[in-house]
């Protein structure tokens, strides 16, 4: 069951996922001059069985030089940020290998992709927060959010996070700070 | 709470156009994809089209492309169906559904009647 | 495209159980695990009732359930009760990245 709403929005923070659960969509984005190719896939699914999950159909962009219809080229990263999106992760980024069953872990960058990547979650999905470059965490609780379903209606659970402006970066749970990440941005992903 | 909203039956003549319209409302309207779905009176269900409001790009079935224009105005989650010359035979009931995981459409509108007689 | 077969009506009595099959080809319902199923009350839209071949969304009963072999789909109705009777359609995601609809099956519920 998809989650309705966004995850809750913190005052100077970010959250994103560790592992993404089954049912998951990643909406296949293309950057500004670029769009799906006409046959290609719509959106990325985290699907599988109980011993293994990956995401299903590739993103693919091309130019929209090549479009011959009058239809409009993918809007500019900074309309994309509107919900359920997250940071693309670097293509360098070493991913750690360890299982987390039942979900996907970050699907790789594909060519010619958005900055912004818009995620559909469902619910079980738990995202994670932290304090953005210059900002650090005070009074800190759970720094973590759940879909949840109520009463046939989904909800995200509120994380107890305040981050305070002192140019000091926190980390996601159980993260020493990267030393070559000047966005503060995890090391390594829980994979599946 | 999520829904998408259809706007109200239309009585048309042949050769009049038509601009028909499904707002997405309780959901991040821009970031899913609307398809069209047409029934004719007492027949089943024919998948026309799809659009994502986020940059518009637009799919068609083979059997409705050139015959119809979906469109959308993300600044108001709002998809369209047009048509720009009605004939008889465009007389149906058109649903929008949201395209949501596994590829289903999860949620539908209510649909719109559409009657073009003479 | 051509429409997903469907056959046309079945029935059955109340308790019993029916199974409704929908027959694509390897481009349609044979390429993917996308194969959908919806029920079409008298006058109402469509409700989506299985997706993924097999899962149902929350709310469905589990007296519903999905199968798939080859490039057939099949919906089958546990228990059926009197509110059961409707239209079925099946629908399945191509691969030229479009949808394809079955051509419905009408169930009555006997007596």
């Known amino acids: 069951e998809l989650c309705d709403d966004d995850p809750p929005e913190i005052p100077h923070a970010t959250f994103k996922a560790m592992a993404y659960k089954e049912g998951t969509m990643l909406n296949c984005e293309c950057k500004r001059g670029f769009r799906r190719i006409k046959s290609g896939s719509l959106y990325m699914l985290c699907t599988g069985n109980s011993s293994h999950s990956s995401w299903d159909n590739q993103c693919q962009c091309t130019s929209s030089a090549t479009r011959n219809t009058t239809k409009q080229v993918t809007p500019q990263p900074e309309e994309q940020k509107e919900r359920k999106t997250t940071e693309m992760q670097s293509p360098m980024q070493p991913v750690d290998q360890a299982s987390l069953p039942g979900h996907c872990r970050e699907p790789p960058p594909w060519e010619n992709e958005a900055t912004e990547r818009i995620y559909h979650f469902v619910v079980g999905q738990m995202v994670y927060y932290q304090c953005v470059q210059g900002y650090r965490a005070l009074h800190r609780g759970p720094a973590e959010s759940v879909c949840k379903m109520t009463h046939g209606k989904t909800r995200w659970t509120q994380p107890q996070l305040i981050c305070t402006g002192e140019m000091e970066t926190s980390q996601f749970p159980g993260e020493e700070k990267p030393q070559a990440s000047p966005e503060g941005r995890p090391e390594s992903e829980t994979s599946c | 709470q999520v829904q998408l909203v259809q706007s109200g039956a239309e009585v048309k003549k042949p050769g009049e156009s038509l601009k028909i319209s499904c707002k997405g409302s309780?959901?991040?309207?821009?970031?899913?994809?609307i398809g069209w779905v047409r029934q004719m009176p007492g027949k089943g269900l024919e998948w026309m089209g799809i659009?994502?409001?986020?940059?518009?790009?637009?799919r068609y079935s083979p059997s409705f492309q050139g015959q119809v224009t979906i469109s959308a105005d993300k600044s108001i989650s709002t998809a369209y169906l047009q048509w720009s010359s009605l004939k008889a035979s465009d007389t149906a009931m058109y649903y929008c559904?949201?395209?949501?995981?596994?590829?289903?459409?999860?949620?539908w509108g209510r649909g719109t009647m559409v009657t073009v007689s003479s | 495209q051509s429409a997903l077969t469907q056959p046309a009506s079945v029935s059955a009595s109340p308790g019993q159980s029916i199974t409704i099959s929908c027959t694509g080809t390897?481009?349609?319902?044979?390429?993917?695990?996308?194969v959908s199923w919806y029920q079409q009350l008298s006058g109402k839209p469509p409700k989506l009732i299985l997706y993924d071949v097999s899962k149902r969304p929350s709310g469905i009963s589990d007296r519903f359930s999905g199968s798939k072999s080859g490039n057939t789909a099949s919906l089958t109705i546990s228990g059926l009760q009197a509110d059961d009777e409707a239209d079925y359609y099946c629908?399945?995601?191509?691969?030229?990245?479009?949808?394809?609809f079955g051509g419905g099956t009408q169930l009555t519920v006997l007596g």
């Open positions: 629908s399945s995601y191509t691969r030229s990245s479009t949808w394809v």
């Open positions: 390897s481009s349609d319902v044979g390429a993917y695990i996308y």
């Open positions: 309780g959901y991040s309207s821009t970031s899913y994809w």
């Open positions: 659009i994502y409001p986020g940059d518009s790009d637009t």
């Open positions: 559904a949201r395209l949501g995981s596994a590829y289903a459409f999860d949620i």
